[in-house]
């Protein structure tokens, strides 16, 4: 349960991540598991350890082996092993099993591949991809961020696909590969214009001062699995967590799928202990996808408590 | 939003043992320590000890050592304390609270009080 | 183990301006890893305790960024730059640095 199968490429930066996790860590310490013997936190070395991190730059055959990583706290060490292997580089373009990462299915909706492993690195954009060894053009292929988008994917596009970026290490650069498979799968789905079902545009939303309040953004955004879709509330035209309010925060509800099929994504505002500028502000239930962006805004107003008394007396 | 549900307010004999239990929901509780802290008047707040509720192991303050015993259940997402040989001294609010990726006690339960009586 | 030690009660503070409260450690806090293991708590009447600093400065989630905090290695103060009402309860300073963890006695807030 607490040991990892890790591998490489010889003359490649490796980089792993103790199995074990802190609940929190104070520190962690690695060992080659075979010595016993404690692998050096300074960087000068070409193996060396780094918090949860083990570096191998670059890693060499040699370097095979377990290694044991202790996650210290004042409560509890907690023990991990990371299983490396590193293999020699192919001299031909296919990339063996024992290479590949896990398989990742898309369809003509939604075609990401990420880069296995890298947010354990420190890269730069762009990523190179390829596939079968072929350097992928033409304007189908777009590289974002840490994965691969490929446009009106098509069954022929199954295959193998390996990205390949640069780690940087103290001004030194390290290449890394990863491979892993793509298969298409046939979806009917498909993607429209965001549809807001609720706020409804220019709603008054009545409430209580000093109470708490909710605001539900709800939108639909097509059949089947979607590619980007997203539903955001906005405060005067900024973002939420840049507004700076702590009583007001919005939290995702459930990604919704109708038995009509229908996608829907819900976010909802919540307002804590509701203040009189707070009715001041203009509430913009966003809601965007591929097709573009809907707005929906809501105003507050006051709700008067009934009076007791005027009903009694 | 993280919550710990603890048991309601015990009344108990002196000798006597008894299990405080707190709820955990709206995170998995394997991935957390679970602390548990006591609260009087007099001594104000105690460290009693810490359960890894993935593996069982615990770790307790010596004054608690024999006193108290942590365990936790991972299917019912639910970790107890059993507190035994109970004495007028052991009268207390007691909180269960859990750590977080970066440090301890990080949300806290609402509290049992404890009262041992003849 | 390691003490903790707080003023009982700190002066009274009037609405709207800033308040202090020490906290100090007989051991240092600062652990080998660079990171200094003291927290503040407030426990409001009536409710359980709350985090609002860990590893001496930072700010917990969701606590408003009137609270600060700094130290050394064993002495430690909490500032509150605009008290409000709901400010007032009960403030613990705690050392997460070694078992068994250990707490201040608690600092009362109190408003004019």
């Known amino acids: 349960k607490f040991s990892k199968q890790s591998w490489g490429l010889e003359n490649e930066a490796l980089i792993v991540r103790c199995p074990r996790q802190g609940k929190p860590s104070y520190t962690v310490d690695w060992y080659y598991s075979q010595t016993n013997k404690s692998i050096p936190t300074q960087e000068r070395n070409r193996v060396f350890a780094s918090g949860q991190l083990l570096k191998f730059l670059p890693a060499a055959v040699a370097d095979s082996g377990i290694y044991t990583c202790i996650v210290r706290s004042p409560t509890f060490n907690r023990t991990g092993y990371a299983n490396v292997t590193i293999y020699k580089k192919q001299s031909d373009c296919n990339v063996p099993d024992y290479l590949m990462y896990s398989t990742v299915s898309g369809s003509e909706k939604n075609s990401k591949i990420y880069c296995p492993t890298i947010d354990l690195y420190n890269w730069t954009a762009p990523l190179e991809w390829f596939k079968n060894c072929q350097a992928l053009q033409g304007s189908r292929y777009r590289a974002h961020k840490s994965f691969l988008v490929i446009d009106n994917v098509m069954t022929e596009d199954a295959g193998d696909y390996t990205c390949k970026f640069i780690h940087n290490e103290n001004g030194a650069n390290y290449s890394v590969t990863a491979t892993r498979s793509f298969t298409v799968k046939d979806e009917q789905g498909f993607s429209l214009f965001p549809v807001i079902g609720a706020p409804a545009q220019n709603e008054i939303k009545e409430v209580e001062i000093g109470k708490n309040a909710n605001l539900t953004c709800s939108a639909c955004f097509g059949k089947g699995t979607q590619f980007l879709a997203a539903v955001l509330w906005q405060l005067n035209g900024t973002k939420i967590t840049d507004f700076g309010e702590p009583r007001i925060q919005q939290e995702e509800g459930q990604n919704q799928s109708f038995s009509n099929g229908l996608a829907c994504l819900d976010m909802v505002l919540r307002i804590a202990d509701v203040k009189e500028e707070d009715l001041l502000l203009q509430y913009d239930c966003l809601a965007l996808n591929l097709h573009g962006l809907r707005r929906h805004t809501v105003r507050l107003s006051r709700k008067n408590p009934i009076d007791h008394h005027s009903i009694y007396c | 939003q993280v919550q710990l549900q603890q048991s309601g307010a015990e009344v108990v004999r002196p000798g006597a043992s008894v299990t405080l239990s707190c709820k955990a929901s709206d995170y998995t509780i394997t991935d957390y320590e679970m602390h548990w802290v006591k609260q009087t008047p007099v001594h104000g707040l105690e460290w009693i000890g810490a359960?890894?509720?993935?593996?069982?192991?615990?770790a307790y303050s010596q004054n608690f050592k024999g006193k108290a015993t942590l365990t936790a259940d991972e299917s019912s997402s639910t970790a107890y304390m059993e507190l035994s040989s109970l004495t007028s001294e052991d009268s207390a609010v007691y909180y269960c609270?859990?750590?977080?990726?970066?440090?301890?006690?990080?949300?806290w339960g609402q509290g049992t009080t404890l009262t041992v009586s003849s | 183990d390691i003490v903790m030690t707080q003023a009982a009660i700190s002066n009274p503070v009037t609405l709207g301006t800033s308040a202090s409260m020490s906290c100090r450690s007989s051991?240092?806090?600062?652990?080998?890893?660079?990171?200094?293991?003291l927290y503040w708590y407030l426990q409001k009447p009536g409710h359980s305790p709350q985090l609002l600093i860990y590893?001496?400065?930072n700010l917990a989630s969701g606590v408003p960024d009137r609270f600060s905090s700094s130290g050394s290695g064993t002495d430690f103060t909490l500032k509150i730059s605009r008290v409000e009402a709901e400010d007032v309860g009960v403030y613990y300073c705690?050392?997460?640095?070694?078992?068994?963890?250990?707490f201040g006695s608690g600092t009362k807030l109190e408003i004019k």
């Open positions: 590893q001496m400065s």
């Open positions: 051991k240092s806090l600062l652990h080998s890893n660079g990171i200094t293991y």
């Open positions: 705690a050392q997460n640095l070694e078992l068994p963890f250990t």
């Open positions: 609270s859990r750590s977080a990726t970066d440090y301890y006690f990080a949300s």
């Open positions: 359960i890894d509720p993935e593996t069982g192991d615990t």
